[in-house]
């Protein structure tokens, strides 16, 4: 019995920060949960994680390579990442696990969100020499 998650397929980032929303087919306020964001095709890197329940706002903590924070309402967890660089361009997957009360529930793997960090180009206006 798996929970479904909806993510935007693509986020193109001009600045160095992004908000990624994970919308779940389950009421987050019903149970104690652990929400996380993973990077890579094989979800190798746990980017950000937060534990929460109906009585307290979760504390989000990030992998050393990332800066993150998060928020949630009754059906959506939003991860905010900042200080992003071009090499952070990758596919990101939302994951949620509901631990207490039982039974344990988690989500079906989604198609993920490709976060594309655009390289910043400094424009130099060159004055062309007069002929």
């Amino acid at each position: 019995n798996k929970i479904l998650v909806k993510q935007s397929p693509l986020l193109v980032v001009d600045s160095n920060e992004v908000s990624l929303s994970c919308r779940y087919s389950y009421n987050l306020l019903a149970k104690e949960f652990r929400a996380s964001l993973y990077k890579g095709v094989n979800s190798d890197v746990e980017v950000c994680v937060g534990n929460g329940n109906f009585t307290y706002q979760p504390q989000f903590r990030s992998n050393a390579e990332f800066n993150c924070d998060g928020d949630f309402d009754n059906e959506t967890v939003t991860f905010r990442l900042w200080n992003l660089h071009v090499n952070h361009t990758d596919i990101y997957f939302c994951k949620i696990e509901f631990m207490y009360p039982p039974p344990y529930l988690d989500n079906e793997r989604s198609n993920g969100t490709i976060i594309h960090i655009k390289e910043k180009h400094l424009c130099h206006t060159q004055s062309s020499p007069k002929l």
Partner: antibody
Framework: EVQLVESGGGLVQPGGSLRLSCAAS??????????VGWIRQAPGKGLEWIGE???????YYSPSLKSRVTISRDNSKNTLYLQLNSLRAEDTAVYYC????????????WGQGTLVTVSS | DIQLTQSPSSLSASVGDRVTITCRAS??????????LHWYQQKPGKAPKLLIY???SLQSGVPSRFSGSGSGTDFTLTISSLQPEDFATYYC?????????FGQGTKVEIK
């Protein structure tokens, strides 16, 4: 047949660390449906839950021990580990690993336990 | 944390007696009609053994003289006719909330 076998107990100095192992057979630690917890029992006392690990690798710890405990696993060996730091006399206990099902979280299979004595 | 209080702490009984142990939770351990309260038996020097899960379901291989009842905050373990091998310590445990907690135990001794 499901089996859990703990090892690594013995005499430890106060302030030291312990690393206990729990070798699982008859089921996979990384397959959905079950998780494994650690429970301890001080001599002549009741049972105390330490923490647990889910098939995903997610962990939950007792708030009273959270700052000193780490539960991890090695999927290739199908083995679970308990690391407990800054040991004190009150940590002297028999340490059990036990499997739980995801529907009720009841501990249906237990290891035989391993005794840890913290003393100088 | 959810506190579980068992009573009595110890009791003396004879073979064939009906024995009742109670477990009271500091808050309800029910969710969607299921009580996340379990009972274990422990003999000296041995690991605990699951007897009853979800308040009233008998674990496979456990004799039918063991039964559990209750919901919400009040639960009972009953041994209908005590056998010599039943002299042990019995614990209740809740899995409704983290941290999981156990009752302090009830020791069943021979009269």
């Amino acid at each position: 047949e499901v089996q859990l076998v703990e090892s690594g107990g013995g005499l430890v100095q106060p302030g030291g660390s312990l690393r206990l192992s729990c070798a699982a057979s008859g089921f996979s630690l990384s397959t959905g449906g079950v998780g494994v917890g650690w429970i301890r029992q001080a001599p002549g006392k009741g049972l105390e839950w330490i923490g647990e690990i889910y098939h995903s690798g997610s962990t939950y710890y007792s708030p009273s021990l959270k700052s000193r405990v780490t539960i991890s696993r090695d999927n290739s060996k199908n083995t679970l580990y308990l690391q407990l730091n800054s040991l004190r006399a009150e940590d002297t206990a028999v340490y059990y690993c036990a499997r739980y099902g995801y529907y009720y979280y009841d501990f249906d299979y237990w290891g035989q336990g391993t005794l840890v004595t913290v003393s100088s | 944390d959810i506190q579980l209080t068992q009573s009595p702490s110890s009791l003396s009984a004879s073979v064939g007696d009906r024995v009742t142990i109670t477990c009271r939770a500091s808050q309800s351990v029910d969710f969607h009609g299921i009580s996340f309260l379990h009972w274990y038996q422990q003999k000296p020097g041995k690991a605990p053994k699951l007897l009853i899960y979800a308040a009233s379901s008998l674990q496979s291989g456990v004799p039918s003289r063991f039964s559990g009842s209750g919901s919400g905050t009040d639960f009972t373990l009953t041994i209908s006719s005590l056998q010599p091998e039943d002299f042990a310590t019995y614990y209740c445990q809740q899995s409704y909330r983290s941290p999981r907690t156990f009752g302090q135990g009830t020791k069943v001794e021979i009269k």
